[in-house]
C-alpha cells in the first residue's frame, strides 16, 4: 500500500567547514581556527 509523500519542509543548505592552523612566530605558538561560511568561530 503506497504512502503519500510528505516533505520535511526544510531546504538543505550546504556550508563548507574549513579547519586551519597558522604559524604566527616561534614564541607565540599557533592559532587554530574553524571557519564556517567565511566566519572564524573558533
Amino acid at each position: 500500500d503506497a504512502e503519500f509523500r510528505h516533505d520535511s519542509g526544510y531546504e538543505v543548505h550546504h556550508q563548507k567547514l574549513v579547519f586551519f592552523a597558522e604559524d604566527v612566530g616561534s614564541n607565540k605558538g599557533a592559532i587554530i581556527g574553524l571557519m564556517v561560511g567565511g566566519v572564524v568561530i573558533a
Epitope: H6, D7, G9, Y10
Partner: antibody, heavy 123, light 112 residues
Framework: QVTLKESGPGLVKPTQTLSLTCSFS??????????VSWIRQPSGKGLEWLAH???????QYNPSLKSRLTISKDTSKNQVFLTITSVDPVDTATYYC???????????????WGQGTPLTVSS | DVVMTQTPLSLPVSLGDPASISCRAS???????????LEWYLQKPGQSPKLLIY???NRFSGVPDRFSGSGSGTDFTLKISRVEAEDVGVYFC?????????FGGGTKLELK
C-alpha cells in the same frame, strides 16, 4: 496572497482527451515542500483525489485512474496541468486544483483551493 | 483503498448547541513518518472546500476556536462547541496518508 484558478473547455465529447490548467499566484512550485493536487467533485456528490505534483517534479496518481491521467507543471509560468484521456460521462464534475504547502517538518496541508472549473462530458 | 466512513449523514443542530461528527478509517492512517494526516474541511453551498483542521487536531489559520479535532489510528472526531449560522454546510474528513487519498462521504450540518 495565494490564489489558484482552474480553466478548461467546459464541454467535451466522450472518448476525447481533456486538458485542464491551474494558474496560480502567491507561491512558487520551485519552493521546497510545495505541491499541487487535482481533486474533482460530481455535482451534489463527494470529493475524489486525482493526482499530485511536487516541487521537484515527482508525481503521485490515483491508481484507479492512473492510466488515463497525466499531471505536469510549468514552474516559470506558475501553472499546473492535468490531462485525462478517453473521457466518459462519469467524468462530469467540477475540477479543483489545490495547493499543499509544507510549513515545517512534515507539517503540510491542503490550505488553498481554486474556485473550481465545471466540466460536462456529453455527446 | 482506505475507506473513510462519516457519521451522521445529516446533523440538525440548534444555534448555540454543540455538534459532533465522526470519521472512521478502514485501516490505520498513521504515516511511516509518525504523523497522522487526517484533515477536516467545510464546504458551503456554491463554494470550494475550506480547511478547518489538519493532522487530526491542528486548527488552520483563522479558524475559530469553537472547532476542535481529536482521535487517533482509525477513529476521529470533529467537534463544534457552539454552532453558529455560518457553520452550515457539508463537512468532509480526508486522509492524506495512503494513496489514493480518500475523503469521507460528508456530513451536512443544518440548523433546526
Amino acid at each position: 496572497q495565494v490564489t489558484l484558478k482552474e480553466s478548461g473547455p467546459g464541454l467535451v465529447k466522450p472518448t476525447q482527451t481533456l486538458s485542464l490548467t491551474c494558474s496560480f499566484s502567491g507561491f512558487s512550485l520551485s519552493t521546497s515542500g510545495m505541491g499541487v493536487s487535482w481533486i474533482r467533485q460530481p455535482s451534489g456528490k463527494g470529493l475524489e483525489w486525482l493526482a499530485h505534483i511536487y516541487w521537484d517534479d515527482d508525481k503521485q496518481y490515483n491508481p484507479s485512474l492512473k492510466s488515463r491521467l497525466t499531471i505536469s507543471k510549468d514552474t516559470s509560468k506558475n501553472q499546473v496541468f492535468l490531462t485525462i484521456t478517453s473521457v466518459d460521462p462519469v467524468d462530469t464534475a467540477t475540477y479543483y486544483c489545490v495547493r499543499r504547502a509544507s510549513s515545517s517538518r512534515y507539517d503540510d496541508q491542503f490550505d488553498y483551493w481554486g474556485q473550481g472549473t465545471p466540466l460536462t462530458v456529453s455527446s | 483503498d482506505v475507506v473513510m466512513t462519516q457519521t451522521p449523514l445529516s446533523l440538525p443542530v440548534s444555534l448555540g448547541d454543540p455538534a459532533s461528527i465522526s470519521c472512521r478509517a478502514s485501516q490505520s492512517i498513521v504515516h511511516s513518518n509518525g504523523n497522522t494526516y487526517l484533515e477536516w474541511y467545510l464546504q458551503k453551498p456554491g463554494q470550494s472546500p475550506k480547511l478547518l483542521i489538519y493532522r487530526v487536531s491542528n486548527r488552520f489559520s483563522g479558524v475559530p476556536d469553537r472547532f476542535s479535532g481529536s482521535g487517533s489510528g482509525t477513529d476521529f472526531t470533529l467537534k463544534i462547541s457552539r454552532v453558529e449560522a455560518e457553520d452550515v454546510g457539508v463537512y468532509f474528513c480526508f486522509q492524506v496518508t495512503h494513496v489514493p487519498l480518500t475523503f469521507g462521504g460528508g456530513t451536512k450540518l443544518e440548523l433546526k
